[in-house]
């Protein structure tokens, strides 16, 4: 069976029907490049005006304008708000009332696209394997990133969160139109990784999505992650404005000027430092979501009532922090280089500035407890990775899981740890699952490109697709079309249950209280330490405009120094832990 032309609110669209075997039978309808909104530079997205005739939806559209990896050029385009749909079809009748899974990509709110990285037309976020194996509809889409998606003056002149609003427009479009593709508009699951996972979290917290989202999956990221909310948008807006020659004293004039500046210039005016800086690299993630008093009306910690009826899976990779550790402490990955106590202390103090010397010392002490007994470089390097993993991913995720569970009415809560080791041959032998290592398995790459993978990789992929799509179907990862290797029990506040995802998943894979000692440290010991005021002088950005990264400001609830008074945003980070 195949859909043919589908009528949407914008007009007719026609995709392609791809047979899954030479013998006919099952197939998948694929639609690429359906417009879901339009947007002017640094403005909220608007409904797409639509078209007459039948739109040929057969090619991915360009990604939203962003810097290249080298950060010296741009690619993509401003006209980028398009989505892609995969609809599995059986032999006879077209699919009807299928669960819908909407993917939000990661990339530090700075890069990425709905189709993902591409090698020889093999796109990372190709929805075919999830759709056909799980019998669900998969939707991916583009949203604005970098300055164009998240630049904000911290007031009404440039409220920011444009990229989040793009995401919302895509979700709302799916709600209004997916029935015509055979989807169930009342069963939408949003899922994402890294910045996409934090976006998923933020979308569930935003009042704008009331009634749109049934379930959510966050893979390595949360609204509570220290890198997910910018507390000093004005500082970074001024930095960009100076570079492109816009006034900085009056936010109204600055906004007006930025809106008419070449978008490519805006994009290139910001560079993320990839070489070691004074502070951990995440503090230089300038253009990220803000508490705007509207789309994100309050501190995320105060918005969990909005998730009371949204089923949630959240988890991390067991060495999510590795990617960041290699930038902050480059020796971590280098066999011939050593990590010193000073290196680690500097890293720790960069993540605990809000609590001053006492915070840094207490954190350093607990994380280095094992060093007396095992002072090996391997142990020290693993400690660096564990620390970054905890601060950036584990602790925020654990707090979010607890918040979700505590506020749940009908909602169910599940937790996982992805531990299938990285396949990167250049990594150390002790390496676990790095940040983003889970993506290939969720998107079924071991099946799509079997020559590049081992049977154990296919086992991991099969299990993840089964759990993820069952959850999308029923709200329970164990119940649905796909058999699973073991029962995944819901998260409870008492036991902190989580599923450890490895190549062999058995009943022993259900575990409890992940890194409980460290969770208690951050939530209790560290939390009660007095907050200190940072040295105002450290905040002066360099005069030299060519400087890649000015020292990031922050308010004193964050982990970097106190901002200039006029730069602070009213809403404070929660006092849950001192990020």
């Amino acid at each position: 069976a195949k859909l043919g032309a589908v009528y949407t609110e914008g007009g007719f669209v026609e995709g392609v029907n791809k047979k899954l075997s030479l013998l006919g039978g099952d197939s998948v309808d694929i639609f690429k490049g359906i417009p879901f909104a339009t947007a002017k530079t640094l403005e909220n997205p608007q409904r797409h005006p639509g078209w007459q005739g039948t739109l040929k939806a057969t090619n991915f559209k360009k990604r939203c304008l962003q810097a290249t990896i080298t950060q010296d050029n741009t690619y993509g385009q401003e006209d980028c708000l398009y989505l892609n749909i995969w609809v599995p079809q059986g032999r006879k009748q077209v699919s009807h009332n299928l669960p819908v899974m909407v993917w939000i990509y990661g990339g530090a709110f700075l890069m990425g696209s709905g189709q993902g990285a591409n090698f020889l037309k093999n796109y990372l976020y190709d929805g075919e394997e999830i759709a056909t194996r799980g019998n669900v509809i998969v939707v991916t889409f583009n949203y604005r990133v970098g300055p164009l998606g998240f630049l904000s003056t911290g007031d009404a002149n440039l409220p920011g969160n444009f990229g989040l609003r793009d995401q919302h427009m895509a979700i709302a479009w799916v709600k209004r139109n997916i029935a015509a593709f055979g989807g169930d508009p009342d069963n939408i699951t949003i899922f994402g990784e890294s910045a996409g996972a934090a976006s998923v979290s933020l979308q569930t917290l935003s009042p704008y999505n009331k009634g749109l989202i049934r379930r959510a999956i966050s893979q390595s990221g949360m609204a509570l992650s220290p890198w997910a909310i910018q507390k000093n948008p004005l500082f970074w807006a001024k930095t960009i404005a100076k570079k492109v020659g816009c006034p900085t004293e009056d936010t109204g004039k600055m906004a007006a000027c930025l809106k008419i500046t070449d978008p490519r210039a805006l994009t290139l005016a910001y560079k993320l430092p990839v070489k070691k800086q004074e502070y951990p690299v995440v503090h230089y993630l300038a253009f990220i979501p803000v508490i705007d008093g509207d789309f994100i009306p309050d501190d995320p910690i105060n918005l969990y009532n909005n998730t009371a009826d949204i089923d949630y899976i959240a988890g991390i990779n067991n060495m999510d922090g590795h990617l960041f550790a290699t930038i902050d402490v480059p020796a971590v990955d280098k066999t011939k280089q050593t990590v010193t106590e000073e290196d680690f202390y500097r890293l720790v103090s960069g993540h605990t500035v809000a609590k001053g010397l006492k915070g840094a010392q207490a954190t350093f002490d607990i994380y280095t407890e094992s060093w007396a007994q095992d002072p090996s470089q391997e142990n020290m390097k693993k400690t660096v990775v564990a620390f970054e993993t905890d601060v950036l991913f584990l602790i925020p995720t654990e707090i979010a899981l607890a918040q979700h569970k505590a506020h749940a009415k009908s909602a169910k809560t599940y937790s996982y740890l992805f531990s299938h080791p990285s396949r990167m041959p250049i990594y150390p032998k002790w390496m676990g699952a790095d940040h983003a290592d889970d993506l290939q398995y969720v998107f079924g790459k071991p099946f799509a490109t079997p020559l590049g993978y081992r049977p154990q990789d296919r086992a991991v992929s099969k299990a993840m697709i089964a759990y993820w799509t069952n959850f999308a179907r029923s709200g329970d990862p164990n119940m649905g079309n796909s058999p699973v290797p073991t029962h995944w029990y819901p998260y409870t506040l008492e036991n902190g249950n989580y599923l450890d995802i490895t190549k062999t998943i058995t009943s022993a894979s259900m575990k409890e209280h992940l890194r409980e000692k460290f969770l208690k440290f951050w939530a209790v010991t560290f939390e009660v330490l007095p907050t200190v005021t940072g040295d105002q002088d450290t905040l002066t950005p360099p005069e030299d405009d060519s400087e890649v990264a000015p020292d990031p400001p922050s308010d004193d609830s964050q982990v970097v120094p106190v901002p200039p008074t006029d730069d602070s945003v009213e809403a404070q980070m929660p006092a849950t832990i001192g990020f």
Epitope: G4, A5, V6, Y7, T8, E9, G10, G11, F12, E14, R47, H48, P49, G50, W51, Q52, G53, T54, M169, A172, K175, R176, N177, I178, A179, A180, P185, K210, G211, L212
Partner: antibody, heavy 119, light 105 residues
Framework: QVQLQQPGAELVKPGASVKMSCKAS????????MHWVKQTPGQGLEWIGV????????SYNQKFKGKATLTADKSSSTAYMQLSSLTSEDSAVYYC????????????WGQGTTLTVSS | QIVLTQSPAVMSASPGEKVTMTCSAS?????MHWYQQKPGTSPKRWIY???KLASGVPARFSGSGSGTSYSLTISSMEAEDAATYYC????????FGGGTKLEIK
Amino acid sequence: QVQLQQPGAELVKPGASVKMSCKASGYTFTSYNMHWVKQTPGQGLEWIGVIYPGNGDTSYNQKFKGKATLTADKSSSTAYMQLSSLTSEDSAVYYCARDYYGSSPLGYWGQGTTLTVSS
Amino acid sequence: QIVLTQSPAVMSASPGEKVTMTCSASSSISYMHWYQQKPGTSPKRWIYDTSKLASGVPARFSGSGSGTSYSLTISSMEAEDAATYYCHQRSSYPTFGGGTKLEIK
């Protein structure tokens, strides 16, 4: 200017079929979607379906699948709706209406055809 | 499909009076459109994209709303405004409200 001409009335027997016409003028017929809408005193306005005359693509309200068939004749710039297996429930005023543009409201309406199903 | 519920079903207003009618959607939509229909005639596009007036529509009419709640307002009722007003949403399955019949007192 844009005009959509529909016959004023049709009287048919239960069980029979009827093919209503909607002749378009004042614009390029093959460039705009044509919708059909049913109006009854009890049910108000109901969207039946849409056709793109340029290539014949159609979409129907689930409720009218199997009941209504939309076609278009490019040479005469006329859209048609055939209703089959008629019952008294099908008695209503039927309008053809052209998109104003993409996802805007229906901008141009015919005068409507009153269908009476009676033996 | 999205269900639109209009209220009230029937209302009457004196000349010069302010009139407000509402349209509630069963789930969030991006824009609402409104039609005016008088007996024996076809519906006319009246307000589109929630708040924009179609050409020829008097300035006393206005539309507003977002999400699931929308309204049409007449700042000062006139005799020629007596008609039935339908709200309308364009998703993949367009739907109409049941109509509000506005009578002159």
